[in-house]
Interface confidence: medium
């Protein structure tokens, strides 16, 4: 059985303050069943950015329909970027359970925020 891969193709993305940022993430397999979550930062201090299953994430939208059968694209778009959004974002696959168990993280995409040109 091929090992699940979580692929974040861009190592870095640069966006002007006020614009939207797209962070790409795909998985190599639909198995095992379980959600994808996005975090900013790693370790215990990481910040939950997007969780399809529950919560309210008003500035974040899924690029593809994550509820569609056989969807393997879990890219997100973050709107109205500010300097405080800068950091490294990780796409993380969980195995469904009670609670869900973290399986694999993508390599991360560093988001840098440029001053908006005046």
């Amino acid at each position: 059985e091929e090992e699940l891969q979580v692929i974040q193709p861009e190592k870095s993305v640069s966006v002007a303050a006020g614009d939207s940022a797209t962070l790409n993430c795909t998985v190599s397999s639909l198995i095992p069943v379980g959600p994808i979550q996005w975090f900013r930062g790693a370790g215990p201090g990481r910040e939950l950015i997007y969780n399809l299953k529950e919560g309210h994430f008003p500035r974040v939208t899924a690029v593809s329909d994550p509820t569609k059968r056989n969807n393997m694209d879990f890219s997100i778009r973050i709107s109205n970027i500010t300097p405080a959004d800068a950091g490294t974002y990780y796409c993380v696959k969980f195995r469904k359970g009670s609670p869900d168990v973290e399986l694999k993280s993508g390599a991360g995409t560093e988001l840098s925020v440029r001053a908006k040109p005046s």
Partner: antibody, heavy 119, light 108 residues
Amino acid sequence: DVQLVESGGGVVRPGESLRLSCAASGFSFSSHAMNWVRQAPGEGLEWVSRINSGGGGTDYAESVKGRFTISRDNSENTLYLQMNSLRAEDTAVYYCAKQYDWNGFFDYWGLGALVTVSS
Amino acid sequence: ETVLTQSPATLSVSPGERATLSCRASQTVGSKLAWHQQKPGQAPRLLIYDATNRATGIPDRFSGSGSGTDFTLTISSLQTEDSAVYYCQQYYYWPPYRFGGGTKVEIK
């Protein structure tokens, strides 16, 4: 409906400790960063501390750093503020405030808990 | 650190008249500015976020404008229940989160 209810306030002497709690309901507590904001008598609002949704990331105002500790129990939907080495200038109403998203404004506030530090 | 300066400190307005409150940031905060209302003896309540968006349940007599460093909260037709202190809050740079010093709105 979102509800935030603080408890644990009271009167203490300088140098003593107190722990505030904030019971949250009506939203997905584990998905939101939470904050403590205080207001000294007759004064404006002062941000005190923030904790991220998972509980592992914390920030503090310089005025409380090293004395106050913010924590949360996502299984109990409760936010805490452990206040040590209290000073007279910590006297205030302490509000817990829900953050709209990880990098956002405070969209709901608790009713507040009064902490009085006096000898 | 971004400093928010609110003016005037106190505003006395007759019922039905317009009230205009100002909040100025020491550096740009984009559109990341909120306004909170605090009535005497009560907790703050969110009125406006992202400079111009009214929070849920807020009457349309409240409106926000501005971006960058200069922001305005307007109460188009003041009601007696609008007597309160109004605070602006920036969330463009943090920590720390910063609030303005407040504007007290009194009914004439």
